[in-house]
Amino acid sequence: IWELKKDVYVVELDWYPDAPGEMVVLTCDTPEEDGITWTLDQSSEVLGSGKTLTIQVKEFGDAGQYTCHKGGEVLSHSLLLLHKKEDGIWSTDILKDQKEPKNKTFLRCEAKNYSGRFTCWWLTTISTDLTFSVKSSRGSSDPQGVTCGAATLSAERVRGDNKEYEYSVECQEDSACPAAEESLPIEVMVDAVHKLKYENYTSSFFIRDIIKPDPPKNLQLKPLKNSRQVEVSWEYPDTWSTPHSYFSLTFCVQVQGKSKREKKDRVFTDKTSATVICRKNASISVRAQDRYYSSSWSEWASVPCS
Amino acid sequence: RNLPVATPDPGMFPCLHHSQNLLRAVSNMLQKARQTLEFYPCTSEEIDHEDITKDKTSTVEACLPLELTKNESCLNSRETSFITNGSCLASRKTSFMMALCLSSIYEDLKMYQVEFKTMNAKLLMDPKRQIFLDQNMLAVIDELMQALNFNSETVPQKSSLEEPDFYKTKIKLCILLHAFRIRAVTIDRVMSYLNAS
């Protein structure tokens, strides 16, 4: 058993049929010695008396808010949560496996630039009695500071019969140099509590590997005389690291109709303009990627051909 | 030989071209190592990230873009920063700074060249003959060093009398390649920046 936060404790249980469970001793936080009784949750049934209460925690029915009283007055609370371990593996029931970029990916993180600011998000089908807390650091043995905000519900989607909820959090490395060469990864730890179930999820990454620039901005078309070709130009996104001559981007320019299956014109360039063939009912799209370190491409920025 | 000066002359372009070749070569070599050594811990997640130039050169700091010198975090990231002495930073004599930057890059290349050559000599003794260093990568390191045009004491190639542990050597190769790729990215960024300015 360990303390998650003040008056909240996590009991780690090997979860299998007829498991013996864990013996837990609760101590009432009071100078009083006599006349103390214990109850669980909203029940008025007295579980025991005395300053300490010894319980055998085997299942979720044994978890919850234990309260010690004296003469109708509440003295203190202890909330017990369960963390299940099945076949040596901690449970991951609360969050959905996003399976990208690989299986068992519960947390996904992205950064728009090298400033040390990044966003992580996760998915769940649970809508109520759910809380998250996020901590982060650079490295684990001698951790350097990363400050994370509160996790918030950022999107709701309908997937078949189920509703899916996306939560996200923004974090900022306390003293980040955009030009630095990372040797220690960022560690992100998410504590998830659903009702009386506790789970924790972690992700470890270098900022350079989670870079995904914003789409290029200010796309403009200029038809070329006596030609089917158009010159398309754009600018670096405002959120990209500066100076741009140091943090350079490369671009993919594509002309395509509404359907992915339609034929296309595609060209790659390090410049902020390109010449392509425009077709009726097609769109010109441009996306960006770090020129020197191939992490993710940005989303597409698009303009219609006509 | 003269120290390079910070005039945007065509002399910088060969360095940019060579640095692009360098990044390409080390990326290809790393990809080859990952494929060939698929049963060894050779991915970014699996290896320890070591920097053989740590405390010996200070390329990131010496080559910091002017725009980032106002960022405290960029100046404090290493004890041996070339540019934290106040007068240098205040005036930032570009040609002097650029010389420091390029000489730091040169020293990086020299250190990696020695490590890679030593390692290749060991890998050539491996009866499995599983992986060797791409001669193209070694040639590209050499070309960029020549383009940088610095005189420097030659570092003797390390020789070892003991029987090499090929498993350890291959893991060390992965660690070196990952670190060198990261440094090659920095070098490419620096050359692009210098070329533009």
């Epitope: 089917r228 070709q229 490369t250 299956r261 339609e262 034929k263 296309k264 014109d265 595609r266 060209v267 790659f268 360039t269 390090d270 010449t275 063939i277 077709r279 009726k280 | -």
Partner: antibody, heavy 118, light 107 residues
Framework: QVQLVQSGAEVKKPGASVKVSCKAS????????LHWVRQAPGQGLEWMGW????????EYAPKFQGRVTMTTDTSTSTAYMELRSLRSDDTAVYYC???????????WGQGTMVTVSS | EIVMTQSPATLSVSPGERATLSCRAS??????LHWYQQKPGQAPRLLIY???QSISGIPARFFGSGSGTEFTLTISSLQSEDFAVYYC?????????FGGGTKVEIK
Amino acid sequence: QVQLVQSGAEVKKPGASVKVSCKASGYAFTDYYLHWVRQAPGQGLEWMGWIDPENGDTEYAPKFQGRVTMTTDTSTSTAYMELRSLRSDDTAVYYCNANKELRYFDVWGQGTMVTVSS
Amino acid sequence: EIVMTQSPATLSVSPGERATLSCRASQSISINLHWYQQKPGQAPRLLIYFASQSISGIPARFFGSGSGTEFTLTISSLQSEDFAVYYCQQSNSFPLTFGGGTKVEIK
């Protein structure tokens, strides 16, 4: 699967014209761009131009501008390349090729040998 | 127009050996570079597109790399069926242009 079958070999006199056909099958004809590339005996490859069968748009290499015409017949899924004012150095194998991407060549026809000789 | 230069013109390699073919562009073409293989009496066949993207059905021993002006096609271990002429082609701008080819022959 996607297939391109070209017309047979031709022998032409200098100054004459030649029209080579390329019949497509295995895909919706208007879904792919069609290019023509030629190869003189023992020489390399030379791009001549492309046509979009969907709308008849064409782009020709400057070298062939004014001397080449590329057309398509969507009813028969056939592309045509006509080269006029033939010279002896037009002697080559002419390939048609198709791709969903405009700028490179995925599926090739078997080639048509055109010999220009007096 | 962009001029593509391939080297060497002929490469003599023993089966099982590695072959490295070069292609240089007269100006920067990013990764708009494609490789083809042509055997005598046959049409060319696309091997690699956009400098390094492999085509399904093409053996993994064919490996493309490069960007800007310098590109390489590497055949890691030559098989008898790999002896052919290899062409690079740029798609950065029209007119599309090919290199002069590299003939890979048996040593």
